[in-house]
Amino acid sequence: TPEVWVQVRMEATELSSFTIRCGFLGSGSISLVTVSWGGPNGAGGTTLAVLHPERGIRQWAPARQARWETQSSISLILEGSGASSPCANTTFCCKFASFPEGSWEACGSLPPSSDPGLSAPPTPAPILRAD
């Protein structure tokens, strides 16, 4: 069964800067990745970035840089201040549309006990939805 993992890290140098890494553990071809915060995309979450393997990347503030790390994983750097700034308990979600498996989504947040610059290893997060 395909799985999605999500890793959230706060940068030690900039406390308002977060890095989100997401990956897809499956055999299919990824057609679209959507990163959101505040909950799953389409369920109250706000889209931060959309990555398409051929057509490119779209991102919305406070996303600063979204990129493909491998064919099945992405990273997103967020930075902000004030209302658009993420906080330590913000939930980030990644949805992978994979062909032919369908859509798989998981969410994660900063580990509560972690120091800035540290994070939990990228283990698969609970799968919230498989369309």
């Epitope: 057609s31 779209r58 991102q59």
Partner: antibody, heavy 117, light 107 residues
Framework: EVQLVESGGGLVQPGGSLRLSCAAS????????MHWVRQVPGKGLEWVSD???????YYLGSVKGRFTISRENAKNSLYLQMNSLRAGDTAVYYC????FGNGMDVWGQGTTVTVSS | DIQMTQSPSSLSASVGDRVTITCRAS??????LGWYQQKPGKAPKRLIY???SLQSGVPSRFSGSGSGTEFTLTISSLQPEDFATYYC?????????FGGGTKVEIK
């Protein structure tokens, strides 16, 4: 109600210029890619240009360098500046919305551009 | 550029008939494909997205299938309001390209 309304079409001589506008309403404009698609009367559909939420632009080869797509998110507006127009650019031009990567879902009613001397 | 070859270019059918339209992509596009219906003097309307998902509000007699390079739009039982021109569109890569269209006429 989600709506796209084009304007600015008309008759122009070869070599002339025209600026098309598209007014969007009923959705969060900045969240979508916006496209221009054209159709020669009685013929098929042809994609012309796309602009991403932050202004990334893409063009059909035959219009590159002559057409410029732009958007004003604060005004919920999309534009197509068409220069050095040719007879082959005569068509109905549609403004179209796309949730990036998921295909075009909402179309305007179209505005007609006629290039003729 | 990705070429989309649509067939047939036209067909004649009767109300109640099952109609099948095909689009072939010149290279693999996964399921980045939509189907559109256009009536004279009107803007196109999306019927199917992601190759096989039915657009909200579209009757269930329309269905899409396929992936990679071969795609099909099926109308299970043709209704009077279905006489129109149908187009496929690939949005896998730039430039986005449409099929040439299939005009469905009354027999």
């Amino acid at each position: 109600e989600v709506q796209l309304v084009e304007s600015g079409g008309g008759l122009v001589q070869p070599g002339g210029s025209l600026r098309l506008s598209c007014a969007a309403s009923g959705f969060t404009f900045r969240n979508y890619d916006m496209h221009w698609v054209r159709q020669v009367p009685g013929k098929g559909l042809e994609w012309v240009s796309d602009i991403g939420n932050s202004g990334e632009t893409y063009y059909l080869g035959s219009v590159k360098g002559r057409f410029t797509i732009s958007r004003e998110n604060a005004k919920n507006s999309l534009y197509l500046q068409m220069n050095s127009l040719r007879a082959g650019d005569t068509a109905v031009y549609y403004c179209v919305r796309e949730e990036f990567g998921n295909g075009m879902d909402v179309w305007g009613q179209g505005t007609t551009v006629t290039v003729s001397s | 550029d990705i070429q989309m070859t649509q067939s047939p270019s036209s067909l004649s059918a009767s109300v109640g008939d099952r109609v099948t339209i095909t689009c072939r992509a010149s290279q693999g596009i996964r399921n980045d494909l939509g189907w559109y219906q256009q009536k004279p003097g009107k803007a196109p309307k999306r019927l199917i997205y992601a190759a096989s998902s039915l657009q909200s509000g579209v009757p269930s007699r329309f269905s899409g299938s396929g992936s990679g390079t071969e795609f099909t739009l099926t109308i299970s039982s043709l209704q009077p309001e279905d006489f129109a021109t149908y187009y496929c569109l690939q949005h896998n890569n730039y430039p986005l390209t449409f099929g040439g269209g299939t005009k469905v006429e009354i027999k």
